[in-house]
Interface confidence: low
Amino acid sequence: AVNGTSRFTCFYNSRANISCVWSQDGALQDTSCQVHAWPDRRRWNQTCELLPVSQASWACNLILGTPDSQKLTAVDIVTLRVMCREGVRWRMMAIQDFKPFENLRLMAPISLQVVHVETHRCNISWKISQASHYFERHLEFEARTLSPGHTWEEAPLMTLKQKQEWICLETLTPDTQYEFQVRVKPLQGEFTTWSPWSQPLAFRTKPAALGKDT
């Protein structure tokens, strides 16, 4: 960042999107600002318009190509600049030498579905979205289950330390409504972070058979 009150954070989704957030204390809300991306080894550059997300922060997505195209590699460097209009000229407000595969945040897992449900257990699968083939199997997942009367924040985290796109939830209560979420993270990258949580999948366990112990 250009000064101490500015924060410029970006993540690469491993395929064709860099998402950026810029926050600046005392910045004018009506100033027009953009993020400019200049790769060191590619014959393209890209710009996105920063849009306000709060009083002093702006966000935008650099769309580098079609969603599943592999636009950057582990040795790419992308110079990212925040440029804000000052009258007839543009002023650089922040700059960073962005290493895409050191700053990864994948898309949330998709296509969650119940494979099999019983009274006390439920098998759920999902798919990863727009994840680079470079990762091979070097991914991990976190999952959580929302029980009645609890919040997501209270839900214990289950960790899957390998690329496993399913889970078998055990010790569930019969005839009970649950929700399930999962997120993914590559093992690569110093500043890599978890993907957003998936859309919740609602499911209900089967009722216990009448006359039987549960």
Partner: antibody
């Protein structure tokens, strides 16, 4: 016209340090990365490191403990400092820049500056 | 590090001859470059991204290849082509060069 001009070469004692400058003209070092490559007498080319337009660096791991690349944007100049020099560091040192498409290989080179490490 | 091995290490050919230099990478590379270096001079970029001719470079120079195997060709050798030629990869750090091929006129 893009130009790179190295300076600071000469005779250095073993165990000493060298500080080279690469003065850029025709472009700004806030817009382009500058690389350093060396060539020992009668030998091939060896990439040493790079300083990116935003100021971060990448080094050849073989030199990372004794190499520092920095720059002064106001002077449009890149600096190369190497410590603990030994005879095998005797070489012509070049700074280089990629082409106008921001990545076209090393399209621009300085003339090189000779560093001799000897007692 | 990726090793780049050029062959031959030197060659002698007549003016007008077709000259071919190969560059073998120790692992697959995506971006390959060729440079010409005349004695006492800085290298000059000839070919970028495997097969693209750099600005101002005569069309008798060409490049091809993929993966681990690349080729550089001078279709009709000229006296001013006397130089050492280097390949270079830019797929993984550190960037590495071949050991060079010295081209001489018979």
């Amino acid at each position: 016209e893009v130009q790179l001009l190295e300076s600071g070469g000469g005779l250095v004692q073993p165990g000493g340090s060298l500080r080279l400058s690469c003065a850029a003209s025709g472009f700004t070092v806030t817009s382009y990365a500058v690389h350093w490559v060396r060539q020992a007498p009668g030998k091939g080319l060896e990439w040493l490191g790079v300083i990116w337009s935003g100021g971060s660096t990448d080094y050849n791991a073989a030199f990372i403990s004794r190499l520092t690349i920095s720059k002064d944007n106001s002077k449009n100049t890149v600096y190369f400092q190497m410590n603990s020099l030994r005879a095998e560091d005797t070489a012509v040192y070049y700074c280089a820049r990629a082409g106008d498409a921001n990545y076209d290989g090393f399209a621009y080179w300085g003339q090189g500056t000779l560093v001799t490490v000897s007692s | 590090d990726i090793q780049m091995t050029q062959s031959p290490s030197s060659l002698s050919a007549s003016v007008g001859d077709r000259v071919t230099i190969t560059c073998q990478a120790s692992q697959s590379v995506s971006f390959l470059y060729w440079y010409q270096q005349r004695p006492g001079k800085a290298p000059r970029l000839l070919i970028y991204d495997t097969s693209n001719l750099a600005s101002g470079v005569p069309s008798r120079f060409s490049g091809s290849g993929s993966g681990t195997s690349y080729t550089f060709t001078i279709s009709s050798l000229q006296p001013e082509d006397i130089a050492t030629y280097y390949c270079q990869q830019w797929s993984t750090y550190p960037l590495t060069f071949g050991q060079g091929t010295k081209v001489e006129i018979k």
